[in-house]
């Protein structure tokens, strides 16, 4: 049962796992939510009636029942994490705490103008998790407008006190919006000879970089495979850092894989959740249910839907026992990793999917998908934008797609002809064309960025970057789509969708309603073959039904390509150019993005 | 109106190389892809490559890849194939196309063609 | 490559005929499919494309008919000038291919 409100004047008593210092019973909830073992929390806020060592402490907690013994006591904030919970989770955490001093290890001090400067440094310094900042009102001369940058082995401050004129924060990393280099690839052969700040069992390199990502400590990792010629060593999954923030030593190492910390992706925080299937693997821990099920993704969802389950292994029935049900084992661990994994025995194993809301914006679940028919409903595609031009009249000029709250990314070729961005207008939310009244509120463009290698679609490097004039407030209807990353390159997608207001055939008038085509993927070698008087590089990709009928059409130009991939939607392409529309067998080919996240970094966190 | 005006005949010696000509008029020569294809005597149509003068990319047939060389002159509106190390099966007409549609398709528009003969 | 096989390789008939030219493609290719006429000396010329469309200046008696592999050259009612090679080519996938032609002559 998920519940959100906080119990004032409440105790849970005993089921301690460990406590760390929050500025609030707020952030102590997130904590809680993001902790692998904690379902409850007391939070002890400032009251003079309680020992002020007392205050600021979040006591992480855990019950098998899923619930603890209430007692009053004053100052005493308790509730439930939100993994219970079905609604969309997020470490992010933009507020700014005044009078209080977070206390971590100062590893940098440095002048700043102001708390959000303070809190924008800490946010692009790789080491820190928090920050001090004290005011210009500060009575010590030579500490005002100091900006310490903190850091400590959870994530949390080791103490905080209250101290006037003086205000302290977290590191927006979690918010997606660090400028730091974000370092997708998987490095094979590879050991990181570094200091471990912890280590844990996982199956796969893949894994091992998730669980570094929400490590507070982790900047990169080593793991060793399955095939490590030290046995003990198999599977393990060492987290390290190092003062500089990268790997002072690389050692080629066979069997070992290496890669960093996706902390600092600002375009797409990894998913946190596991969704892989472990075929003849084992994971061992603590058991919480031996419960039996038809197969390996029912295992996943009663493991899914148990609170306290972390990871699981099925084993398949044996013949025709027990109505053809395999066994399906509910365990969990201390840290939510498995304390052995084990090879050969038979068995399937994965992980809950209960943490796959631990993401950013971009990853929030939307609307389901309505089956069928072309015509899409509000909502169902909220990153999808209409971009407008006013000269000389007002028309429907491309699509494009939401990345961040002041971006859109669309293609180049759709502003041939156009000088200037005071002409442009981009509407969100919008399903149908026919909302757009004149005092319908718009989005102003600031800036049209278009890629300088860009010459025509046909040739590539057909992208572009919108920079808005004002901020997008995220909403049901208007929120980003996630930018696919470097390490998903060789993934398969199943699901992608391509929508737009465009013709649906040649010659057609632009749609009132979003169109939407559910398309699948064809191999770039297939689509060379379909254009033999066009080079289709690596840096597009194709789609398109063999026996056409449903493709992207003129006025598509610029919209999104987007597939879903475990649970979460990608940016996958931009609409770029093809034949006609949906002519059978000649797919539509879009700009691929993957291959300009890079750029897009670049070009959205330049200063 | 559409017109593809190519080069005369020629006649070559076992080893040696051929240049034909192919003038476009009458269009965006850029728009279109201009597509080889040549004939031997009594024989049936073979497809050699295609170039796409918009962009100067080229296409070849697996079966002349090492020997066939497509080039366009976007100025001049002429495109050109060479053919080296010529030998006596290459004798043939050979014909420039411009395709139908901008992306491949049919081929609507033929030149006259050029008749190469090789003979030592 | 796709192979297009085209029958009969010759034909007889009069004027006034209904004649029909079959093409088999080795595998599917969809609707990209074109009939080109060609007469001794001459550059061929496209008749019809994506299988049934006509293409400009075209007379009616010429009509295209078939799907993924099998497709059909009709004429309806045969003139003195209809009497030359055809030839199918398919577009689907790239080299282009062309049948080995259908020499139409008169009875």
């Known amino acids: 049962e998920c519940v959100t409100q906080l119990l004032k004047d409440t105790c849970f008593e005993g089921g301690d796992i460990t406590t760390v210092f929050t500025p609030s019973a707020k952030y102590c909830q997130v904590v809680c939510t993001y902790h692998p073992r904690c379902l409850l929390f007391t939070f002890t806020a400032e009251s003079p009636s309680e020992d002020p060592t007392r205050w600021f402490t979040c006591v992480l907690k855990d019950s098998v029942t899923e619930t603890l013994p209430r007692v009053n006591r004053t100052a005493a904030i308790s509730g439930y994490s939100f993994k219970q919970c079905s609604h969309q989770i997020s470490a992010c955490n933009k507020d700014i705490y005044v009078d209080l001093d977070m206390k971590g290890i100062n590893y940098n001090s440095s002048v700043a103008k102001s708390a959000q400067e303070c809190q924008e440094r800490c946010t692009d310094d790789v080491h820190c998790h928090f920050f001090t900042y004290a005011t210009r009102q500060f009575p010590s001369l030579e500490h005002r407008n100091i900006c310490l940058l903190k850091h400590t082995q959870t994530g949390t401050p080791t103490r905080i006190t209250k101290l006037d004129k003086v205000v302290s924060g977290f590191s927006l990393k979690s918010c997606a919006l660090s400028n730091l280099a974000c370092i997708r690839d998987i490095f094979p052969n590879t050991v990181f000879a570094d200091s471990n700040i912890d280590s844990v069992m996982a199956p796969d390199a893949f894994v091992c970089g998730r669980i570094c990502t929400h490590h507070p400590g982790c900047l990169f990792f080593t793991f060793f495979s399955q095939e490590w010629p030290k046995e003990s060593q198999r599977n393990l999954c060492l987290l390290k850092t190092s003062e500089s923030g990268l790997p002072s030593t690389r050692i080629k190492k066979s069997k070992a894989l290496s890669g960093f910390s996706l902390q600092s992706c600002r375009h797409s925080i990894p998913v946190f959740c596991h969704s892989s299937f472990y075929h003849d693997t084992d994971f061992l821990g603590e058991e919480l249910d031996i419960v039996a099920a038809k197969s390996h993704e029912a295992c996943q969802k009663l493991c899914t839907n148990a609170v306290r389950c972390q990871f699981f292994t099925y084993t398949p029935a044996q013949a025709s026992c027990n109505e053809g049900k395999g066994k399906c084992y509910l365990k969990l661990s201390s840290n939510g990793s498995p304390t052995k994994i084990l090879h050969g025995r038979g068995g399937i194993s994965g992980y809950t999917l209960r943490l796959c809301k631990m993401d950013n914006e971009c990853t929030t679940k939307i609307k389901p998908r309505i089956v069928g028919g072309t015509a899409s409903v509000r909502g169902e595609w909220p990153w999808q934008v209409t971009l407008h031009t006013t000269s000389p009249t007002q028309r429907h000029l491309c699509g494009g797609s939401i990345i961040g709250n002041q971006w859109i990314l669309t293609a180049a070729h759709c502003f041939y002809g156009v000088e200037s961005p005071k002409i442009l207008r981009v509407y969100s939310g919008i399903l149908n064309q026919s909302e757009i009244k004149e005092d319908t509120s718009f989005f102003g463009v600031q800036e049209i960025i278009i890629h300088d290698q860009y010459k025509m679609a046909e040739s590539g490097y057909d992208i572009a970057l919108l920079k808005l004039e004002t901020t997008v407030n995220y909403t049901d209807s208007q929120r980003p789509i996630c930018l696919p990353s470097k390490g998903d390159r060789n993934v398969i997608y199943t699901d992608c969708w391509v929508t737009g207001w465009g013709y649906r055939k040649l010659r057609d008038k632009i749609q009132n309603t979003l169109q939407k085509a559910k398309i699948p993927l064809v191999t770039n070698e297939e689509c060379q073959k379909r254009y033999r008087g066009h080079k289709i590089t690596h840096k597009m990709i194709c789609a398109g039904y063999r026996e056409g009928g449903k493709d992207a059409c003129k006025g598509d130009s610029g919209g999104p390509l987007s597939c879903k991939h475990n649970e979460v939607w990608h940016l996958v392409g931009i609409t770029s150019w093809g034949e006609g529309c949906a002519q059978r067998e000649r797919p539509g080919v879009y700009t691929n993005v993957v291959e300009y996240v890079d750029w897009i970094l670049e070009k959205t966190q330049a200063v | 109106q559409v017109q593809l005006v190519q080069s005369g005949a020629e006649v070559k010696k076992p080893g040696s190389s051929v240049k034909v000509s192919c003038k476009a008029s009458?269009?965006?020569?850029?728009?279109?892809?201009i597509e080889w294809v040549r004939q031997a005597p009594g024989q049936g149509l073979e497809w050699m490559g295609v170039?796409?003068?918009?962009?100067?990319?080229?296409n070849y047939n697996e079966n002349f890849k090492d020997r066939v060389t497509i080039t366009a002159d976007e100025s001049t509106s002429t495109a050109y194939m060479e053919l080296s190390s010529l030998r006596s099966e290459d004798t043939a007409v050979y014909y420039c196309?411009?395709?139908?549609?901008?992306?491949?398709?049919?081929?609507?528009?033929w030149g006259q063609g050029t008749t190469v003969t090789v003979s030592s | 490559d796709i192979q297009m096989t085209q029958s009969p390789s010759f034909l007889s008939a009069s004027v006034g005929d209904r004649v029909t030219i079959t093409c088999k493609a080795s595998?599917?290719?969809?609707?990209?499919v074109a009939w080109y006429q060609q007469k001794p000396g001459k550059a061929p010329k496209l008749l019809i494309y994506?299988?049934?469309n006509r293409y400009t200046g075209v007379p009616s008696r010429f009509s295209g008919s078939g799907s993924g592999t099998d497709f059909t050259l009709t004429i309806s009612s045969l003139q003195p000038e209809d009497f030359a090679t055809y030839y199918c080519?398919?577009?689907?996938?790239?080299?282009?291919?062309f049948g080995q032609g259908t020499k139409l002559e008169i009875k």
């Open positions: 196309a411009r395709t139908y549609g901008k992306y491949g398709g049919a081929m609507d528009f």
């Open positions: 009458g269009y965006a020569f850029s728009n279109y892809l």
């Open positions: 170039i796409n003068p918009g962009s100067g990319y080229t």
């Open positions: 595998q599917s290719v969809s609707n990209d």
């Open positions: 994506y299988i049934s």
């Open positions: 080519q398919q577009d689907y996938s790239s080299p282009p291919t």
